[in-house]
């Protein structure tokens, strides 16, 4: 058993049929010595008396808010949560496996630049009685500070018969050094509590590996005289690291119709303009990627050809 | 060329070669389909490699003030990786495929380090640690880790030379 926060405790249980469970001793936070009784949740049934209560925790019915009283007055609370371990593996019932970029990916994180600011998000089908708390650091043995905000519900989607909820959190490295080569990864730890179930999820990454620039901005077209070609120009996204002579991007320019199966024109460039062939009913799209490190491409920025 | 304590490097040449290094480093070990190396106990094997750190003057301001500190750090790293790529980690079993870009990568690391430091001038170089894995699978894992680490190192070096070519070239 360990303390998650004040008066909230996590009991780690091996979860299998007829498991013996864990013996837990609760102590009432009071100078009083006698006349103390214990109850669980809303029940008035007295579970025991005395300053300490010993219980055998085997299942969710044994978890919950234990309260010690004296003469009708509440002295203190202890909330017990369960953390299940099945076949040596901690449960992951609360969050959905996003399966990208690999199986058992519960947390996904992205950064728009090298400033040390990043966003993580996760998915669940649970809509109520759900809380998250997020901690982060650079490295684990001698951790350097990363400050994370509160996790918030950022999107709701309908997937077949189910509703899916996306939560996200923004974090900022306290003393970021954008130009340095990272040697220690960022660690992100998410505590998830659903009713009386506790789970924790972690992710470890370098900012360089989660970079995904915003799409290029201000796409403009200039038809070339006596030609099917147009010059398309764009600018670096505002959110990208500066100066651009140091933090350079490379671009992919594509002309394509509405369907992916349609023919296309495609060219890669380090410049912020390119000449392509425009077709009626097609769009010109541009996306960006770090020029020197193969992290994710941005989403496409598009303008119609006509 | 960058002479210790002295003149500017051939920024444009260094830019071209460092960008080539980036391409080679990624073709030697594409990201796709490989194990997540951080799960394999990264610390003890790749902590010894030289990293371009915050105080090394490789940021745009540091380069403007005095690029020599940064260039020396890059040179140290290039020599270090060049030695690693020539060591039995890469020459031993399992043999690299003959079409592996590691050979080109090795030659290009040497080429860039020579551009930065002509013969007869010496910057202090870092000792290469004795990483001698006994098992072929350990060697394979170590290669992946070294190449991943090299990708990050050459990316920073390429940014330095691109910025230098754009803003510090005479």
């Amino acid at each position: 058993i360990w303390e998650l926060k004040k008066d909230v405790y996590v009991v780690e249980l091996d979860w299998y049929p007829d498991a013996p469970g864990e013996m837990v001793v609760l102590t009432c936070d009071t100078p009083e010595e006698d006349g103390i009784t214990w109850t669980l949740d809303q029940s008035s049934e007295v579970l025991g008396s005395g300053k300490t209560l010993t219980i055998q925790v085997k299942e969710f019915g044994d978890a919950g808010q234990y309260t010690c009283h004296k003469g009708g007055e509440v002295l203190s609370h202890s909330l017990l949560l369960l953390h299940k371990k099945e076949d040596g593996i901690w449960s992951t019932d609360i969050l959905k496996d996003q399966k990208e970029p690999k199986n058992k990916t519960f947390l996904r994180c992205e950064a728009k630049n090298y400033s040390g600011r990043f966003t993580c998000w996760w998915l669940t089908t649970i809509s109520t009685d759900l809380t998250f708390s997020v901690k982060s650091s650079r490295g684990s043995s001698d951790p350097q500070g990363v400050t994370c905000g509160a996790a918030t519900l950022s999107a709701e989607r309908v997937r077949g018969d189910n509703k899916e909820y996306e939560y996200s959190v923004e974090c900022q490295e306290d003393s970021a050094c954008p130009a340095a080569e990272e040697s220690l990864p960022i660690e992100v730890m998410v505590d998830a509590v659903h009713k009386l179930k506790y789970e924790n999820y972690t992710s470890s990454f370098f900012i360089r590996d989660i970079i995904k620039p915003d799409p290029p901005k201000n796409l403009q077209l200039k038809p070339l005289k006596n030609s099917r070609q147009v010059e398309v120009s764009w600018e670096y996204p505002d959110t990208w690291s500066t100066p651009h002579s140091y933090f350079s991007l490379t671009f992919c320019v594509q002309v394509q119709g509405k369907s992916k199966r349609e023919k296309k024109d495609r060219v890669f460039t380090d410049k912020t303009s390119a000449t392509v062939i425009c077709r009626k009913n097609a769009s010109i799209s541009v996306r960006a990627q770090d020029r020197y490190y193969s992290s994710s491409w941005s989403e496409w920025a598009s303008v119609p050809c006509s | 060329r960058a002479v210790p304590g002295g003149s500017s490097p051939a920024w444009t040449q260094c830019q071209q070669l460092s960008q080539k290094l980036c391409t080679l480093a990624w073709s030697a070990h594409p990201l796709v389909g490989h194990m997540d190396l951080r799960e394999e106990g990264d610390e003890e094997t790749t902590n010894d490699v030289p990293h371009i750190q915050c105080g090394d003057g490789c940021d745009p301001q540091g380069l403007r003030d005095n690029s020599q500190f940064c260039l020396q750090r890059i040179h140290q790293g290039l020599i270090f990786y060049e030695k690693l790529l020539g060591s039995d980690i890469f020459t031993g079993e399992p043999s690299l495929l003959p079409d592996s870009p590691v050979g080109q990568l090795h030659a290009s690391l040497l080429g860039l380090s020579q551009l930065l430091q002509p013969e007869g001038h010496h910057w202090e170089t870092q000792q290469i640690p004795s990483l001698s894995p006994s098992q072929p699978w350990q060697r394979l894992l170590l290669r992946f880790k070294i190449l991943r680490s090299l990708q990050a190192f050459v990316a920073v070096a390429a940014r330095v030379f691109a910025h230098g070519a754009a803003t510090l070239s005479p």
Epitope: K263, K264, V267, F268, T269, D270, T275, R279, K280 | -
Partner: antibody, heavy 118, light 107 residues
């Protein structure tokens, strides 16, 4: 199977015009760009121009501008290359090539030898 | 027009050898570079597109790399059917241009 079948060899006199054809099969003709590339004897490859069969848009290499016409007939799934004012240096194998991507060539015809000789 | 220079113009090699052909562009072309193989009396065949992307059906012994101005095609463990002429082609801008070709012949 995507295939391009070209018309047979031609012998022409200097100053004449040649028109060669390229019949597509195994795909929807207007879904691919069609290019013409030539290769003089023992020489390299030279791109001449392309057509979008869907709308008839064309683009020609400056070297051939004014002498070359590329057309496409979607009713017969056939592309054509017409080269006028022939000279001896136009002696070459002419290839049609197609791709869904505009700038490189995925499928090639077998080639048509055009000999220009007086 | 962008000039493409291939080297060497010919190379003699034996079955099992590793052969590397290089292609240099007269200006930076990012990764807009493609490789073709041509056997005598036949049409060219696409091997690699956008510098390093492999084509399904093309043996994995063919690999490409490079960006900017310098590119290479490597044939690992040359097979009898690989003796042919190889061309690079830039697609950075029109007119599309090819290298002069490299003939890989039997030693």
């Amino acid at each position: 199977e995507v295939q391009l079948v070209q018309s047979g060899a031609e012998v022409k006199k200097p100053g004449a015009t040649v028109k060669i054809s390229c019949k597509a099969s195994g795909y929807t003709f207007s879904d691919y760009y069609l290019h013409w590339v030539r290769q003089a004897p023992e020489k390299g490859l030279e791109w001449m121009g392309w057509i979008d069969p869907e709308n008839g848009d064309t683009e020609y290499a400056p070297k051939f501008q004014g002498r070359v016409t590329i057309t496409a007939d979607t009713s017969t799934d056939t592309g054509y290359l017409e080269l006028s004012s022939l000279r001896s240096e136009d002696t070459a194998v002419y290839y049609c090539a197609a791709n869904k991507e505009l700038r490189y060539f995925d499928v090639w015809g077998q080639g048509t030898l055009v000999t220009v000789s007086s | 027009d962008i000039q493409m220079t291939q080297s060497p113009s010919s190379v003699s090699a034996s079955v099992g050898d590793r052969v590397t052909i290089t292609c240099r562009a007269s200006q930076s072309i990012s990764i807009n570079l493609h490789w073709y193989q041509q056997k005598p009396g036949k049409a060219p065949k696409l091997l690699i597109y956008f510098a390093s992307q492999s084509i399904s059906g093309v043996p994995s012994r063919f690999s490409g790399s490079g960006s900017g101005t310098d590119f290479s095609l490597t044939i690992n463990s040359l097979q009898p059917e690989d003796f042919a002429r190889y061309y690079c082609q830039q697609s950075n801008s029109f007119p599309l241009t090819f290298g002069g070709g490299t003939k890989v012949e039997i030693k």
